[in-house]
């Protein structure tokens, strides 16, 4: 069964900068990736970026840069000039589409005990939905 993993990191040098890493584990090629964000329990969500393998990427503030890392993983840099740790209670969701097989979503948030000095590269440990 295909799976999506999500990891949210606080940047060590900038407390107001975050990076969302997402990846797709499964067969098939990716036709579209959508990254969205909102409050807990699906409240107040909106899109941050859309990445198409041929048509390019679109992003919306506070997204700073969306890019492909591999053919099946992406990263999205976020920046907020407001209070430190502005995304602490935010949920980030990544949805990968593989046409015509289907699409899969997973969501994640900044770990509560995030220490910017301990930021590590993402490892593909799936944070999975029950479905």
């Amino acid at each position: 069964t295909p799976e999506v993993w999500v990891q949210v990191q606080m940047e060590a040098t900038e407390l107001s900068s975050f990076t969302v890493h997402c990846g797709f584990l499964g067969p098939g090629s990716i036709s579209l990736v959508t990254v969205s964000w909102g409050g807990p329990d699906g409240a107040g969500g909106t899109k941050l970026a859309v990445l198409h393998p041929e048509l390019g990427t679109r992003q919306w503030a506070p997204a700073r840069q969306a890019r492909w890392e591999t053919q099946s993983s992406i990263s999205l840099a976020l920046e907020d000039s407001g209070a430190s740790s502005p995304f602490a209670n935010t949920t980030f969701c990544c949805k990968f589409a593989s046409f015509p097989e289907g699409s899969w979503e997973s969501c994640g948030s900044l770990p509560p005990s995030s220490d910017p000095g301990l930021s590590a590269p993402p490892t593909p440990v799936p944070i999975l939905r029950a479905d």
């Epitope: 969205s36 409240a43 909106t46 589409a97 015509p100």
Partner: nanobody, 127 residues
Framework: EVQLVESGGGLVQPGGSLRLSCAAS????????MSWVRQAPGKGLEWVST????????SYVDSVKGRFTISRDNSKNTLYLQMNSLRAEDTAVYYC????????????????????WGQGTMVTVSS
Amino acid sequence: EVQLVESGGGLVQPGGSLRLSCAASGFTFSYYDMSWVRQAPGKGLEWVSTINSDGGRTSYVDSVKGRFTISRDNSKNTLYLQMNSLRAEDTAVYYCVEGDPHNFGLENLSLRDFGSWGQGTMVTVSS
């Protein structure tokens, strides 16, 4: 896995009304823009309408403005399309999709350019 299941299609006379529904599951529905697209027999895919994640912003293709209304109920994970004053040229398979085709200014639409898609529901307008 994401699922989008359309319902409400059928045969209706010109001037009649139908309400299409799209039940969503497997993703955080309230975070995403949703659209309706349609494919008439022998024709390409055509964008019909889009609604943003909270339902506060909608847009329509010119040919359905004033006749069709898109809406959503995030508490029920459901997208709707109310179609009034139906015409023969509205005959098509209607698909519920996640995303907004204006993101990339797509002219030749394909279901593969959306984040999720349903199996479609047929609407036939005929006397």
